[in-house]
């Protein structure tokens, strides 16, 4: 029950995190014009990973894509790469974790397989979150460096742009979205890894025990029960002798409301 909850919660947290990473990557406000004290200019400049925008005081906004690839700073390219890797890993992790969820039944998948998939997705989420945090942090560091150097434009020389105005840039909303999203994905991944430990089947072998009931004997084969998936072509173990032991049917066939998160 706790395992299912941990796994489900990890999945949901990672899902929110990855959605945030995607949102941050697409956002235009990675760096925004510093408006400390008073807006010096009547236009507001802000820049993302893919384009830079200018908003005039009338509300009119114009964005221009970075149509050059070679002309872009290496750091910006690195940030783009980190964010994309984070998104790809996160997306694959989500796909894997859907099939790994304890509350979802597919074919005759063993719990060991689900445990492995949960661990895989957890690791993917952790790496995805770290990529996002790293990407955002690299960009933030770039901004801080440029801010204190009073660099007029972070992408000076990019695409033939001429340096003209002493515009200082500070952290945009996308950085905070990225940090939070990366953190959530990381937490989700950790939760998945924790859930994996609880999912791993315990290979306990029960000794053969003979029960004598009214004249003829029925014996259980050694090997005991593996943690059941609750579906597939398992031979049903009939209840022969009470002793408080329930059949697989009674334990697993019908999931309780607590199995869903």
């Amino acid at each position: 029950m706790a395992v299912t909850a941990c796994q489900g919660l990890g999945f949901v947290v990672s899902l929110i995190g990855i959605a945030g990473i995607i949102a941050a990557t697409c956002m235009d406000q990675w760096s925004t014009q510093d408006l400390y004290n008073n807006p010096v200019t009547a236009v507001f400049n802000y820049q993302g990973l893919w384009r830079s925008c200018v908003r005039e005081s009338s509300g009119f906004t114009e964005c221009r894509g970075y149509f050059t690839l070679l002309g872009l700073p290496a750091m910006l390219q690195a940030v783009r790469a980190l964010m994309i890797v984070g998104i790809v890993l996160g997306a694959i992790g989500l796909l894997v974790s859907i099939f790994a969820l304890k509350c979802i039944r597919i074919g005759s998948m063993e719990d060991s397989a689900k445990a492995n998939m949960t661990l895989t997705s957890g690791i993917m989420f952790i790496v995805s979150g770290l990529c996002a945090i790293a990407g955002v942090s690299v960009f933030a560091n770039m901004l801080v460096t440029n801010f204190w150097m009073s660099t007029a434009n972070m992408y000076t020389g990019m695409g033939g742009m001429v340096q003209t105005v002493q515009t200082r840039y500070t952290f945009g909303a996308a950085l905070f979205v990225g940090w939070v999203a990366g953190g959530l994905t990381l937490i989700g991944g950790v939760m998945m890894c924790i859930a994996c430990r609880g999912l791993a089947p315990e290979e306990t072998n029960y000794k053969a025990v003979s029960y004598h009931a009214s004249g003829h004997s029925v014996a259980y084969k050694p090997g005991g029960f593996k943690a059941s998936t609750g579906f597939g072509s398992n031979t049903k173990n009939k209840k022969i002798y009470d002793g408080g032991a329930r059949t697989e049917d009674e334990v697993q066939s019908y999931p309780s409301k607590h199995d869903y998160v």
Epitope: V43, S58, N153, T164, T167
Partner: antibody
Framework: QVQLKQSGAELVRPGASVSLSCKTS????????IHWVKQRSGQGLEWIGR????????YYNENFEGKATLTADRSSSTAYMQLSSLKSDDSAVYFC?????????????WGQGTSVTVSS | DIVMTQSPSSLTVTTGEKVTLSCKSS????????????LTWYQQKSGQPPELLIY???TRESGVPDRFTGSGSGTDFTLTVSSVQAEDLAVYYC?????????FGGGTKLEIK
Amino acid sequence: QVQLKQSGAELVRPGASVSLSCKTSGYIFTSYWIHWVKQRSGQGLEWIGRFYPGTGTAYYNENFEGKATLTADRSSSTAYMQLSSLKSDDSAVYFCTREGYGKGNAMDYWGQGTSVTVSS
Amino acid sequence: DIVMTQSPSSLTVTTGEKVTLSCKSSQSLLNSGNQKNYLTWYQQKSGQPPELLIYWASTRESGVPDRFTGSGSGTDFTLTVSSVQAEDLAVYYCQNDYYFPFTFGGGTKLEIK
């Protein structure tokens, strides 16, 4: 069509205050900045400040801080400028203007102007 | 504050003549984000409010005759009237639309012979 109609000429005593109005029509009043510009007789133009009726935000030229107060009445789509502690060098024609959308912060429509004469 | 300097202060021309008005700003009005110059030209005829002619240094306002052309970048701008007409008799102002406070040039008075 867009129109900005300003109140009539004012003759005021030194030290007094005056409120100039600018009634707008033909556009959504709360979506555009209103600027005020001063023009002394036979001289150039001087930007006083601007007011955004949608939020009540105002920016002033430092030279007019404390002299001019910009406000608006959204219900009547009218912008106001109050000039206080008037002196003789406040005698001028005052224009209200609208900042255009997607025109590089340029003022695309102007009122006819209100003449203010400060005299004892 | 940004200082806008216009020259000449007055100019007398004959109709049909080409005229060039100059405007210089003390700081660049080019915004690197969109590569646009935030300079505006206005025309003020006697006894009337100014009228918008050119914005973004070179974009003509709708309804403005195509004989009016704005050019320049950074700190140096020009307004060219390719063939002056009698109705062009006016004072022409350039304005910094980029830095606060917005500032106007002293104006160039265009007179017709």
